[in-house]
Interface confidence: medium
């Protein structure tokens, strides 16, 4: 027999045994040109010394063979003795080591067995009712096909599936969709209705992401707010990469997970645009506002679960950058302006109500005034910051107000709204004695002290009602007490307190009157008492002796009065309390002891004021002696 013909003789080996796991398989035969044909197959097992024979039986029952040696591919023409217009049965017998192995048979009509192409070009992938739908253009002149797919995950081997018959210019296949792992798919085709015809090669891999994109595991950090009012958002941890099947590990498109950053600026709700989406690679600068940042993972099927973080507002405040002037027409704020044509967002919120939405106002684009300041004014009628409470004010700026990532913080500060002058007036002013010539003035903290940076200082005013001399004493905003010293005994004073802000003088508190009565020192009281006692004692002793002598001469003795109550003292808890000297003084001199006397004008609210007390039971001594301060001396404060 010739090498190009099918030899109609018995093959040169014993009968085939197809029971072996190894041997020839996947035989496919097809027309490759108008008169040319090709059969090819796979051989499983050791190939050394293997001879292959392609067997063919015609419909008449006659059989022949082609000897191909070690080759697993054979081309022949329609003149090779094999009927191409009628059905034939083909199989491969492989002879090796005195043993013959046989492939499964293929029955087909060679002329009609066109070599089918796999799906080519762009395979569109979509999701349909929880399944994967693949669609592609049918290769030219190959309408009518049977289609198979195979798929694998990173941890599984290939699984075969059937797409069913196709008979259109576009072909499609429904495949299983995995929820959480990526898959690799390949497709192949063969002529419809010819079971024995060969399959095409497998298509290029189609890489399919999981139905749910992975949860983005990322971490952010925010830098400190810079002097320019911006802070950088930085990514501390990149998202973890998806595990991919073998054929998808190169630059295969389709399984990519893209991560996007969605910024939501919570502050300044009156601005035009509150959210912006940008790629994770393009980390933005932020103002000092509060933001919600979401990382959204998406794949070809759309967005998946997102992870949201809250970036709190920067709490750093500038107590002096904002100037506020309150006039009859309303209130105006001034602050250092930004560049030309800048839009400002002024936001205010009562302190303690941070959870609620802030109020804000967007200015028209403005240029700096000649002093380099920007301004915002509002009337009393508008009700803005009208309540007498502490407000947190933040001013943001942008040359492009519609661009969320281009806002910056100009300043953040506090302001006391309403009639701050009156509302801030200190209450519960009280005066207590402190020493022989000084008093302690106390008051309840001003409402302004609840507003960080607003209360600049307290001022305590002391007026000598005799000379009408007035002195004012500044007190730190954190203090609520001052000591007024160098006071004169017997003089009436009035004291008032006010709370000042940087831009506003407060209103004085109700005047409190007090005076210091001149008192004798403890030593004087002691010696005076002792002298009186000794004098009485002496007089008593002398009188007693004298009377005794006289009585003895004038009156006879009387019996002892046992039951008489005539000379009993009334029962009671009357105590005599001596004011003891604090220290022994060599020179027992007259000292001024202070008694503070408070008095109020009629109709004025009486505050709880403590009178400087002497020890209980000690007599109050008012001396006629007027002890005066030297001329020019006033109240002096000790803080």
């Amino acid at each position: 027999c010739g090498t190009s013909e099918c030899c109609f003789q018995d093959p040169p080996y014993s009968d085939a045994d197809s029971g072996s796991a190894s041997g020839p398989r996947d035989l496919s035969c097809y027309r490759i040109s108008s008169a040319g044909y090709e059969c090819s197959w796979q051989y499983e097992g050791p190939t050394a010394g293997v001879s292959h024979f392609l067997r063919c039986c015609l419909s008449s029952g006659r059989c022949c063979y082609f000897a191909t040696g070690s080759a697993t591919r054979l081309q022949f023409s329609d003149q090779a003795g094999v009927s191409v217009l009628h059905t034939v049965t083909l199989w491969v017998e492989s002879w090796a080591r005195n043993r013959t192995e046989k492939s499964p048979e293929v029955t087909l009509q060679l002329y009609k067995s066109v070599k089918y192409k796999p799906p080519l070009g762009d395979i569109k992938v979509s999701k349909l009712a929880g399944q994967l739908r693949m669609e592609w253009e049918t290769p030219d002149n190959q309408v009518g096909a049977e289609v198979q797919f195979r798929h694998r995950t990173p941890s599984s081997s290939w699984k075969l599936g059937d797409c069913g018959p196709q008979d259109d210019d576009t072909e499609s296949c429904l495949c299983p969709l995995e929820m959480n792992v990526a898959q690799e798919f390949q497709l192949r085709r063969r002529r419809l209705g010819s079971q024995g015809s060969s399959w095409s090669k497998w298509s290029s891999p189609v890489c399919v992401p999981p139905e749910n994109p992975p949860q983005p595991q990322v971490r952010f950090s925010v830098e400190q707010l810079g002097r320019d009012g911006r802070r950088r958002l930085t990514l501390k941890e990149q998202p973890t990469q998806l595990e991919l099947p073998e054929g998808c590990q190169g630059p295969a498109p389709g399984v990519e997970v893209t991560y996007q950053l969605q910024l939501h600026m919570l502050s300044c709700p009156c601005k035009a645009k509150a959210t912006r989406t940008l790629p994770l690679e393009k980390m933005p600068y932020l103002s000092g506002a509060a933001y919600n940042v979401a990382v959204i993972s998406s794949n070809r099927f759309g967005p998946g679960p997102n992870q949201t973080w809250h970036i709190p507002a920067d709490t750093h405040t500038e107590p002096v950058a904002l100037n506020i002037s309150v006039g009859t027409n309303g209130t105006t704020m001034y602050w250092p302006a930004r560049a030309q044509s800048t839009t400002y967002c002024i936001e205010w919120q009562p302190v303690g109500q941070e959870g609620s939405l802030a109020t804000c106002n967007l200015t028209a684009p403005q240029d700096p005034d000649p002093a380099g300041m920007a301004t915002y004014s509002w009337s009393r009628e508008s009700g803005a910051m009208g309540q007498e409470k502490c407000y947190h004010i933040t001013i943001f700026a942008s040359a492009h107000p519609k661009k969320l990532t281009l806002w910056s913080t100009v300043l953040s500060t506090y302001h006391f709204g309403g009639n701050a002058s009156a509302a801030g007036t200190p209450h519960h002013v009280s005066v207590k004695n402190h020493s022989l010539d000084s008093v302690s003035v106390d008051w309840a903290p001003s409402l302004l002290s609840t507003c960080p940076g607003v209360l600049k200082e307290y001022v305590v005013r002391c007026r000598d009602e005799d000379s009408n001399q007035v002195s004012e004493h500044p007190v730190q905003p954190t203090e609520t007490q001052v000591t007024l010293s160098d006071l004169r005994a017997g003089v009436a004073y009035t004291v008032q307190v006010r709370a000042d802000t940087a831009w506003l003088r407060g209103a004085w508190s109700q005047p409190q009157r007090f005076s210091i009565k001149v008192q004798v020192s403890d030593w004087f009281i002691f010696f005076a008492s002792l002298g009186s006692f000794l004098s009485i004692l002496l007089v008593g002793v002398l009188g007693y002796l004298g009377l005794n002598r006289a009585t003895r001469h004038l009156c006879p003795p009387l019996p002892t009065p046992c039951a008489s109550s005539a000379i009993q003292f009334p029962a009671g808890k009357e105590t005599w309390q001596w004011i003891n000297p604090v220290d022994f003084q060599e020179e027992a001199s007259l000292q001024e002891a202070l008694v503070v006397e408070m008095s109020w004008d009629k109709g004025e609210r009486t505050e709880l004021l403590e009178k400087a007390e002497l020890p209980e039971g000690a007599p109050e001594l008012a001396l006629d002696t007027q002890l005066s301060l030297e001329d020019g001396d006033r109240c002096k404060a000790k803080m």
Partner: antibody, heavy 121, light 107 residues
Framework: QVQLVESGGGVVQPGRSLRLSCAAS????????MSWVRQAPGKGLEWVAG????????EYADSVKGRFTISRDNSKNTLYLQMNSLRAEDTAVYYC??????????????WGRGTLVTVSS | AIQMTQSPSSLSASVGDRVTITCRAS??????LAWYQQKPGKAPKLLIY???SLQSGVPSRFSGSGSGTDFTLTISSLQPEDFATYYC?????????FGQGTKVEIK
């Protein structure tokens, strides 16, 4: 008014270096991101590099990464492009362009007139 | 890098015509797209930013639309000074990329 004036272009041999400058005036230079964009003769525009307002962030096109360096001197209101290991394909008109705000983002609202760089042996 | 594809590459039109130029991105770029006009020997000029916002000083006959991957620049009534080359540019992600340009010529 905003003005951007490029300088430093010229003819240079392949492998050599060149430094371009861009003098800015008429706006607060420290508040704006800046970029270099080039245009080869008869071709389209190609973004080369960008720098944020403070100079802390720089970005480059893949074609120049590792060879070109963008920098700025805010005290002199000047943008620079240091070009090393020049190639024939770097021949182009180089434009200095301003971003509308402090980051290299949102397109370019002002452009210089350009300076021609010719890389030829 | 994101590829920006403009179409057509060139077009001929008459004064008063409505002209539409499209730009397609190889991946979604939200609305981060700008359009420029460039005349021979001149620097480009910004017309549209954020896909549809008109740059100040640009005539209202220019308008932009689109989001994601497909964008359009429209000149509602072409004027003699509008004959130029138009470029789109994405600033969604670095490196920023331009389209190849569309030349608008007089018919």
């Amino acid at each position: 008014q905003v003005q951007l004036v490029e300088s430093g272009g010229g003819v240079v041999q392949p492998g050599r270096s060149l430094r371009l400058s861009c003098a800015a005036s008429g706006f607060t230079f420290t508040s704006y991101g800046m970029s270099w964009v080039r245009q080869a003769p008869g071709k389209g525009l190609e973004w080369v590099a960008g720098i944020s307002y403070s100079g802390s962030d720089t970005e480059y096109a893949d074609s120049v990464k590792g060879r070109f360096t963008i920098s700025r001197d805010n005290s002199k209101n000047t943008l620079y492009l240091q070009m090393n290991s020049l190639r024939a394909e770097d021949t182009a008109v180089y434009y200095c362009a301003r971003s509308p705000d402090y980051i290299i983002d949102y397109g370019f609202d002002y452009w210089g007139r350009g300076t021609l760089v010719t890389v030829s042996s | 890098a994101i590829q920006m594809t403009q179409s057509p590459s060139s077009l001929s039109a008459s004064v008063g015509d409505r002209v539409t130029i499209t730009c397609r991105a190889s991946q979604g770029i939200s609305s981060d797209l700008a359009w420029y006009q460039q005349k021979p020997g001149k620097a480009p000029k910004l017309l549209i930013y954020d896909a549809s916002s008109l740059q100040s000083g640009v005539p209202s006959r220019f308008s932009g639309s689109g989001s994601g991957t497909d964008f359009t620049l429209t000149i509602s009534s072409l004027q003699p000074e509008d004959f130029a080359t138009y470029y789109c540019q994405q600033y969604w992600i670095y490196p920023f990329t331009f389209g190849q340009g569309t030349k608008v010529e007089i018919k």
